[in-house]
Interface confidence: low
């Protein structure tokens, strides 16, 4: 990769809210249709997980099109405001420990563990295999390590110092990486390839964090996740440089990354991804 357009950027983790689609049309690309009108409409962007503006041509298109931002939000996002509960004593835990269990929209029925903020314990639940949220762990031990309090009210292990805990919080699929490294690129680079909800067969690339390489996969045309690139080069640019050597806790992490606004073409949408 050419490095001439890179700069040093301070990396901070950003967390996407849980995504649960009540309708899979929320995963459709924004479709302006064949007509030539200029009408301001809103669509749900599955990658940014937000309702965004687009220009509609006035005819055809698809159902992921709303007259107002409010209508879009009502149809395609769930109100998470009362799902995330934080108290002063709980600040040590990552925010996602306070999310409700979320099986996602698929039907894989995989046994996983989540932190139940009511019982203050990690409990078993059935995960569908896609989407959902980060309160989702492969083992009871990992869940306890990250979200449960120790006997004196503090964390059993500090989130952020345990590599596997970090990885598992980023991807429910629990992609392990060599223990001398931490991943501080976009969290979606750690997610597994996800074909999505539709029936197309488009050639795409995803970043395989186990082997540290971009690999091809077949994309269905809608849904899926952000680990989805139209070229191997785009995939490498977005994800390859995220691995850095571990440093002592508390230090600012600096690593070479792309410019502040890196244009990444993901699935149908072109979105601007702020460096994480």
């Amino acid at each position: 990769d050419s490095e001439e357009d890179e700069e040093h950027t301070i990396i901070t983790d950003t967390e996407l809210p849980p995504l649960k689609l009540m309708h899979s049309f929320c995963a459709f690309k924004a479709d302006d249709g064949p007509c030539k009108a200029i009408m301001k409409r809103f669509f749900f962007n599955i990658f940014t997980r937000q309702c965004e503006e687009f220009i509609y041509g006035g005819c055809e298109g698809n159902q992921n099109r709303f007259e107002s931002l409010e209508e879009c939000k009502k149809m395609c996002t769930r109100d998470n405001a009362n799902r995330i509960i934080k108290t002063t004593l709980q600040q040590e835990k990552p925010d996602f420990c306070f999310l409700e269990e979320d099986p996602g929209i698929c039907r894989g029925y995989i046994t996983r563990y989540f932190y139940n903020n009511q019982t203050k314990q990690c409990e078993r639940f059935k995960y569908g295999g896609c989407l959902g949220n980060m309160n989702n762990f492969e083992t009871l031990e990992e869940c306890k390590n990250i979200c449960e309090d120790g006997p004196n009210g503090f964390q059993v292990d500090n989130y952020g110092t345990q590599l596997n805990a970090v990885n598992n919080s980023l991807t429910p699929q629990s992609t392990k990486v060599p223990s001398l490294f931490e991943f501080h690129g976009p969290s979606w680079c750690l997610t597994p390839a996800d074909r999505g909800l539709c029936r197309a067969n488009e050639n795409r690339f995803y970043y395989n964090s186990v082997i540290g390489k971009c690999r091809p996969f077949k994309y269905s045309g809608c849904g899926g996740n952000e680990n989805n690139f139209t070229s191997k080069q785009e995939c490498l640019r977005a994800c390859k440089k995220g691995f850095i050597q571990r440093i002592s806790k508390g230090g600012l992490i600096k690593t070479k990354r792309k410019r502040k606004k890196q244009r990444v073409k993901i699935a149908y949408e072109e979105i601007f991804v702020k460096n994480m």
Epitope: L21, M22, H23, S24, F25, F28, E60, G61, N62, Q63, E71, K74, M75, R78, D79, I105, C106, R107, L197, C198, R199, A200, G221, C222
Partner: antibody
């Protein structure tokens, strides 16, 4: 076992109103959207409206917007359809159907309730 | 609105025959098509969704295929209990619309 049971059909005068109900059981009510679909005697199926039980967000067939109101009561696991200004052509069997977001299709249907609009 | 056209209102068949019921959309519906079966006096039953995925419990003699505007439901070996009305439906955009139905009857 998923069950959807409609009620509230019957004979209505033209210009009148009626409220159909659908009692859902056998699954978590807020996990799936619910729809109303109607079928005129000897005719095909016609989608009327859809509701997301979690936030009450609705989708309507524009043909019925203004005359039809879909609603739900999560505490009662019930779906409703209020139809106003009824006409003879509204005579149909009205079905309540569970809309499965993964499939984007209606995977369970009630037995239907017949609405007859006649003077 | 998207119009779903089932060109054959009736199709005659015999037990053991292979039969294909077609459905044409007035615009590309991107495989967002479901097929339903309705027997006399009964409510519709979901057979196929996303054009080709069989719903739970549906016998494997039922298959769906298609893309763009053209979709087909095929019954590989018709059984007596398959005699019914078959509807296609697009769920690409609202209003969700159904085809007029194809009635499968015995020769």
């Amino acid at each position: 076992e998923v069950q959807l049971v409609e009620s509230g059909g019957g004979l209505v005068q033209p210009g009148g109103s009626l409220r159909l109900s659908c009692a859902a059981s056998g699954y978590t009510f807020t996990d799936y959207n619910l729809d109303w679909v109607r079928q005129a005697p000897g005719k095909g199926l016609e989608w009327v409206a859809d509701i997301n039980p979690i936030n009450g967000a609705t989708l309507y067939n524009q043909k019925f917007k203004g005359r039809a109101t879909i609603s739900r009561d999560n505490a009662k696991n019930s779906l409703y359809l209020q139809m106003n200004s009824l006409r003879a052509e509204d005579t149909a069997v009205y079905y309540c159907a569970r809309y499965y977001g993964d499939y984007d299709a209606m995977d369970y249907w009630g037995q239907g309730t017949l609405v007859t609009v006649s003077s | 609105d998207i119009v779903m056209t089932q060109s054959h209102k009736f199709m005659s068949t015999s037990v053991g025959d292979r039969v294909s019921i077609t459905c044409k959309a007035s615009q590309d519906v991107h495989t967002a098509v479901a097929w339903y079966q309705q027997k006399p006096g009964q409510s519709p039953r979901l057979l196929i969704y996303w054009a080709s995925t069989r719903h739970t419990g549906v016998p494997d003699r039922f298959t769906g295929c298609g893309s763009g505007t053209d979709y087909t439901l095929t019954i590989s070996s018709v059984q007596a209990e398959d005699l019914a009305l078959y509807y296609c439906q697009q769920h690409y955009t609202t209003p969700y619309t159904f085809g007029g139905g194809t009635k499968l009857e015995m020769k």
